[in-house]
Amino acid sequence: LRLLDHRALVCSQPGLNCTVKNSTCLDDSWIHPRNLTPSSPKDLQIQLHFAHTQQGDLFPVAHIEWTLQTDASILYLEGAELSVLQLNTNERLCVRFEFLSKLRHHHRRWRFTFSHFVVDPDQEYEVTVHHLPKPIPDGDPNHQSKNFLVPDCEHARMKVTTPCMSSGSLWDPNITVETLEAHQLRVSFTLWNESTHYQILLTSFPHMENHSCFEHMHHIPAPRPEEFHQRSNVTLTLRNLKGCCRHQVQIQPFFSSCLNDCLRHSATVSCPEMPDTPEPIPDYMPLW
């Protein structure tokens, strides 16, 4: 978790002098509770926005927006703490809006926004806005939270972001798999425009089960420049196991930008349809 660019972050608006500060996520009002505290944020909204860094890279960012309730506690509002928690790592990053002037009611509802938390593809975050000072131990909570799931690199808008492109999102291998005679699979896919090797991972399963009955790895050497964007055809030999008929083919590239952590693409071949007709019963039963 990080902030985009660390350029001057602004929270001031007409009628309010405000500064954005780094926060330890442990506001002083936790330790020294105040008697009078503001009410909670209203109508917390989160959107995925896309922002360029000063270097020109494009990153997904969480755009956080909320409004104030129109009650008298606005007079005791000293700022807000914005917290983003990445759920699978428990990593948390906070910033603090510090109000340098008193808020006054005006003709329209106060609205605040912040769009500088960089988020990762396919990650879920808990986004919390806490009004400051925080409430006394038994006081009503004055925060609002939402869990926000960022789309993965398959998403059309995410595909062109720097983190997705770095992991190979622009490569579309257009995998085709066909079953040949004599227990063979023919795998065909489009090579990317980089002289790097690929790996085909074959995993076979019984018809209705999820534990594998056959696994095979096939290495494809780095193509020459004249082979870029061409189709690569590979024939894989299967183990002759009755019922081991559902095949998952996964292609792992090793692009220089992502090495052994690139996006993988896969295709699945289902088992052939079983005939509905029952086995014929023999006319006689052998006695031995």
Epitope: Q45, I46, F148, L149, P151, A156
Partner: nanobody, 126 residues
């Protein structure tokens, strides 16, 4: 112009099933989370269910959990709601709604619904 057109509502007996459909046009359907919301007679709008852009995540209001199933077909720009074991309290006008935000928030919209359809009426009565 964004359009959401719901269908599939009707009069049904308690315990029976219905399947609602919604066809979307005028925006990149596959980029957005979609939701079903409903409005019972004389009541406010109630969120029913949501589904992420790629169907990877689905959420339901407690009142419909285990009975309703949301799904989508991005190739057909369509959203569905399979409603089983219907009860009288499910009687409402059902709307298909588009999330304003890209991304997905569990338990409702991330950022309001910027569009919803005209609705399809579901009446559960014996």
């Amino acid at each position: 112009e964004v359009q959401l057109v719901e269908s599939g509502g009707g009069l049904v007996q308690p315990g029976r099933s219905l399947r609602l459909s919604c066809v979307a046009s005028g925006f990149a359907f596959a980029d957005y989370a979609m939701h079903w919301v409903r409005q019972a007679p004389g009541k406010g709008l109630e969120w029913v269910s949501g589904i992420s852009w790629n169907s990877g995540r689905r959420d339901y209001a407690d009142s419909v959990k285990g009975r309703f199933t949301i799904s989508r077909d991005n190739a057909k720009n369509s959203l569905y709601l399979q409603m089983n074991s219907l009860r009288a309290e499910d009687t409402a006008l059902y709307y298909c709604a588009k999330d304003r935000a890209i991304g997905y928030c569990s338990g409702g919209s991330c950022s309001d619904f910027d569009y919803r359809g005209q609705g399809t009426l579901v009446t559960v009565s014996s």
